[in-house]
Amino acid sequence: QAGPLPKPTLWAEPGSVISWGNSVTIWCQGTLEAREYRLDKEESPAPWDRQNPLEPKNKARFSIPSMTEDYAGRYRCYYRSPVGWSQPSDPLELVMTGAYSKPTLSALPSPLVTSGKSVTLLCQSRSPMDTFLLIKERAAHPLLHLRSEHGAQQHQAEFPMSPVTSVHGGTYRCFSSHGFSHYLLSHPSDPLELIVSGSLEDPRPSPTRSVSTAAGPEDQPLMPTGSVPHSGLRRHWE
């Protein structure tokens, strides 16, 4: 008896973080023996959608012409072959931005920081939110979460970095999210350029938690150190 059918691969184009109103295509790639593809969305009746395979039958396309809140969430796909259904794909998390107005991102004491010193990036929302995310452009794993505990909502989150090195320099944005769904994010903040001076001989920072990635040091996720602020927010690494 043959083993279980290999799980398909699930991905989104142009990506898994989509602005409200934009189109996105979800692809599920299985094998040439696939007869049907099924897409399931967490907390929605299954199947969420079914599609016949595209020639040469090893993948199917699920189109979302205009991104809305209803499409944001966690997806898995399956394919059916003559011997039955496959294992589920790894999950795809489809995130929508533009659900809330943009937060404000600033650097304390300044976005111009000397290597070896400390800086705190402050993401502030004029209405209470329960998750704040910090994103560094062109980082392989750019998301940092600060999520409030016990449902308490906050107007801000602090992302402390110490000691700062050249790796911390770059362009940052932050997002905020409400308790309705963590797949719904605000518009992005305006970008903040963090400039690190005197950093020619800096050693690479040692992350506070190891990260498995094939990327080089410049692509490591941002890893600020220091205690989480007294705001009731808890740090989550994504």
Partner: antibody, heavy 120, light 110 residues
Framework: EVQLVESGGGLVQPGGSLRLSCAAS?????????ISWVRQAPGKGLEWVSS?????????YYATWAKGRFTISRDNSKNTLYLQMNSLRAEDTAVYYC???????????WGQGTLVTVSS | DLVMTQSPSTLSASVGDRVTITCQAS??????LAWYQQKPGKPPKLLIY???TLASGVSSRFSGSGSGTEFTLTISSLQPDDVATYYC????????????FGGGTKVEIK
């Protein structure tokens, strides 16, 4: 020209209802702003009524005293903000302004206001 | 509850005087404070945002300072055109607020 224009005010009896409108031009209500209703009773100070977020979810907040009687909403296709006011009382008599919260978190654009008079 | 307390409620000063209005928040609002000027029959006009930044087109006679809970609006040299009521406002929006504005300060010329 970037502006807000309120309409829908008038004389209404106590216990009655009224819907105010605020038409935005020169910018989109669905861009990254909050919009609020602020009122001012004759000879009194400014009083925040309600706000709605520009994001697609459209989170709303109300002053504690406005909850249950007032409802803020928006129609992006008409680029218009609304305030539905029910169970009106004499103390709701005021000029009602709509105002936009800018990136600086301040109210950087105001309408001219519309007068609501609650009287029998 | 976040409450803005403005003082004085009325202020009478001579032309050319330096005038100061204060606004106190019952809890920290960082620098998210704005000041407005309102003349009778007109909507408010933004003067200062983020506690100390002058809004576009506003006279440099006006300045703002403070952070956290204590804020000040200063008119360096009072002019007849400055006769108006001034309001402070914090920038937060949430559901536990009675108001986001201070009670107002009416400025008159002696």
């Amino acid at each position: 020209e970037v502006q807000l224009v309120e309409s829908g005010g008038g004389l209404v009896q106590p216990g009655g209802s009224l819907r105010l409108s605020c038409a935005a031009s020169g910018f989109s209500l669905s861009s990254s702003y909050w919009i609020s209703w602020v009122r001012q009773a004759p000879g009194k100070g400014l009083e925040w009524v309600s706000s709605i977020d520009s994001g697609s979810v459209g989170i709303t907040y109300y002053a504690t005293w406005a909850k249950g009687r007032f409802t803020i909403s928006r129609d992006n296709s008409k680029n218009t903000l609304y305030l539905q006011m029910n169970s009106l009382r004499a103390e709701d008599t005021a000029v009602y302004y709509c105002a936009r919260h800018g990136d600086n978190w301040a109210l950087d654009l105001w309408g001219q206001g519309t007068l609501v008079t609650v009287s029998s | 509850d976040l409450v803005m307390t403005q003082s004085p409620s009325t202020l009478s000063a001579s032309v050319g005087d330096r005038v100061t209005i204060t606004c106190q928040a019952s809890q920290s609002i960082n620098s998210w404070l704005a000041w407005y000027q309102q003349k009778p029959g007109k909507p408010p006009k933004l003067l200062i945002y983020k506690a100390s930044t002058l809004a576009s087109g506003v006279s440099s006679r006006f300045s703002g300072s403070g952070s956290g809970t204590e804020f000040t609006l200063t008119i360096s040299s009072l002019q007849p055109d400055d006769v108006a009521t001034y309001y402070c406002q914090h920038g937060y929006i949430r559901g536990d607020l009675d108001n986001v504005f201070g009670g107002g300060t009416k400025v008159e010329i002696k």
